[in-house]
Every structure is written in structure tokens, then in C-alpha cells.
């Protein structure tokens, strides 16, 4: 039985040209974290693995940053990067968790940071 | 298996700089951030900072900024640090590691630097 | 900056003993601590990591337990090779911090 659950960011705003942290943590489950992929809709972002390290997607590789933790940093924000990004947890013996963060950004300086929240 | 081999003990000059270098193997280097640790005799560790060869991107511990300069180089698969203006207080034993929030960390051997007239 | 409040500073146990060193965080710091054992005149060993992982190579005396702020390091049968400073390390923002460190020394 899967009792892991993942808090996010949650939905955040932030500026153009700026920077964002996006975060995951998984709780409340002992198995094993192997491997977490961030995507933005379909597309890969990033992969930290365990053996293998970070991985970022060549077309990204000028604005990601990996981390803090396993967080993934997104650098010279552009309005096109406005949506939905996901974390993917693969974990042994559970299998796979996912977390949403909604980014939206913004051209003004009113950018605010939304609440937390889980997905269980 | 994964190896960080460290530079040899320095013995400096106040004021100088050194450079100081830890070579990685067994494993890709451009994919794990590289830290820094300092560690001056009787004391604990404190962390310097670190770099992800991959993209260069850097920490600093903010009391570190200014006196090291973190780099890689792919080429060699070798990160450095260099320390300035150098006074006694630099003087201890600096530590590579290769971190990791999924596996833990890789410790080099440390490097010794006696900063002395 | 995260603090890193580690207790004891140093301790005394026999051997066979139940030894728990604790870390504690300033502030959540999810499951991002690791626990390392550093022996005189030697590089830090990783014993733990992501507060409950044991590391390759570490005898199953030694475990880990926490999140958020508060993390313990336990080590169920305490033998000679034991004696050594432990320190726990928060890894989960720039810039990491470590805690004062334990020396464990046997009575």
C-alpha cells in the first residue's frame, strides 16, 4: 500500500526574468527514493538519480539549476514558462509519487507565493 | 568506485594565494555537486561552499565569499579552490566531497594548508 | 542561516551500550540531514543520509530517524571501532551547516 505523500510549492507566481525554486518532499513512507523527475507537462526537465546524479534536459540546460535538495531552480523566467510542472518520486518498494506545482509569471512586480498544499 | 583525490599539503605565505585540487573518478563528474569543507585543528567542519561542474553553477557560505573561488574543469574531471589574502585563520585541512541527496556523500583525503611567515 | 544544535558535545558509554546522538534544525529541513563519523587525522565517513538511508559499507548498528526539525543518530550495540566525533550536516538550502559535533569515547 502506497502512504506516501507529497507536498509541493503549491501554485506560485513569480517575475519575468527572474528565478523560482520549485520544491517536492515526500513524507510519511519508508521506501526508498531511487530516482525524481521534474517535467514541465510532457516535457522532461531533469532527472536526479541515485546512482547516476543530475541529469538536465539539453534544452534547458542554460536556465535549470539543479537543486536546492531535490528541488530543480528555473532561471531567466519568460511568460512561456507559465504552467504546470510535476515531480515524479520513483521509490522501491511504493513505486511512483507525483506533485503539480502551478507556476504563473508574471510581467509586473506583484508576483506572490501561493499556500502550500499535499496529493497523497 | 567513486574516488576524490586531493592536492598535497601547502605551506604558504600570509597575503598569497593557493589553489588547491581534487580530481574525481568513478564517476561522471559533470552530474554531482562538488563541496568544500573546512576543518583548522580541534575544530568541527564547516562547509565553503560548492559547485556543479555541469553547468557551474555555485554555493558560497556567505562568511567564504571573497576569500574562495570555487571552479571545474570537464576536461580533467578536477575541481578547485582557491583561497586569498590569506592569514592564519586559513590555516586547516580542506576537504572535497561529492554530494549527493540520494546516496550520501564521497569523501576526498583533505588537503593540509599552513599559512606561516 | 538553518542552525544545526547537536547534543551531546561529548559522551561517555560502554561498550554494548545504546548510544542516540540528536540533531536539531532551526527550522524544517524535510528529510535533508546526513550523519557522518569522522575519525583523528581522517576525512569524514557517511553513515547516513537523507536522515534514515544507511550508507554502502555501514554496519546495521548504526541508524537514523527524524524529519523537519528534530533527528536522531542511534547506535544499538556500541563496539570499539565505535569511538570517534560524529556530526550531522543539513544539505536541503545554501548554505549548509553542520552541527558542533560528538565525541563518543568509551568508558
Known amino acids: 500500500m502506497m502512504t506516501g505523500t507529497i507536498e509541493t510549492t503549491g501554485n506560485i507566481s513569480a517575475e519575468k526574468g527572474g528565478s523560482i525554486i520549485l520544491q517536492c518532499h515526500l513524507s510519511s513512507t519508508t521506501a526508498q527514493v531511487t530516482q525524481v523527475n521534474w517535467e514541465q507537462q510532457d516535457q522532461l526537465l531533469a532527472i536526479c538519480n541515485a546512482d547516476l546524479g543530475w541529469h538536465i534536459s539539453p534544452s534547458f540546460k542554460d536556465r535549470v539549476a539543479p537543486g536546492p535538495g531535490l528541488g530543480l531552480t528555473l532561471q531567466s523566467l519568460t511568460v512561456n514558462d507559465t504552467g504546470e510542472y510535476f515531480c515524479i518520486y520513483h521509490t522501491y518498494p511504493d513505486g511512483t509519487y507525483t506533485g503539480r506545482i502551478f507556476l504563473e509569471v508574471l510581467e509586473s512586480s506583484v508576483a506572490e507565493h501561493g499556500a502550500r498544499f499535499q496529493i497523497p | 568506485q567513486v574516488q576524490l583525490q586531493q592536492s598535497g599539503a601547502e605551506l604558504v605565505r600570509p597575503g598569497t594565494s593557493v589553489k588547491i585540487s581534487c580530481k574525481a573518478s568513478?564517476?561522471?563528474?559533470?552530474?554531482?555537486?562538488l563541496g568544500w569543507v573546512k576543518q583548522r585543528p580541534g575544530h568541527g567542519l564547516e562547509w565553503i561552499g560548492d559547485?556543479?561542474?555541469?553547468?557551474?553553477?555555485?554555493n558560497y557560505n556567505e562568511k567564504f565569499k571573497g576569500k574562495a573561488t570555487l571552479t571545474a574543469d570537464t576536461a580533467s574531471s578536477t575541481a578547485y579552490m582557491q583561497l586569498s589574502s590569506l592569514t592564519s585563520e586559513d590555516s586547516a585541512v580542506y576537504f572535497c566531497?561529492?554530494?549527493?541527496?540520494?546516496?550520501?556523500?564521497?569523501w576526498g583525503q583533505g588537503t593540509l594548508v599552513t599559512v606561516s611567515a | 542561516d538553518i542552525k544545526m544544535t547537536q547534543s551531546p558535545s561529548s559522551m561517555y558509554a560502554s561498550l554494548g551500550e545504546r548510544v542516540t546522538i540528536t540533531c536539531k534544525a532551526s527550522?524544517?529541513?524535510?528529510?535533508?540531514l546526513s550523519w557522518y563519523q569522522q575519525k583523528p587525522w581522517k576525512s569524514p565517513k557517511t553513515l547516513i543520509f537523507?536522515?534514515?538511508r544507511l550508507a554502502d559499507g555501514v554496519p546495521s548498528r548504526f541508524s537514523g530517524s527524524g524529519s523537519g526539525q528534530d533527528f536522531s543518530l542511534t547506535i544499538s550495540s556500541l563496539e570499539s571501532d565505535d569511538t570517534a566525533t560524529y556530526y550531522c550536516?543539513?544539505?536541503?538550502?545554501?548554505?549548509?551547516?553542520f552541527g558542533g559535533g560528538t565525541k563518543l569515547e568509551i568508558k
Open positions: 566531497s561529492r554530494s549527493t541527496i540520494l546516496t550520501g556523500a564521497y
Open positions: 568513478g564517476y561522471t563528474f559533470t552530474n554531482f555537486w
Open positions: 559547485i556543479f561542474p555541469g553547468g557551474g553553477h555555485t
Open positions: 527550522q524544517d529541513i524535510k528529510s535533508y
Open positions: 537523507y536522515a534514515t
Open positions: 550536516l543539513h544539505h536541503g538550502e545554501s548554505p549548509y551547516t
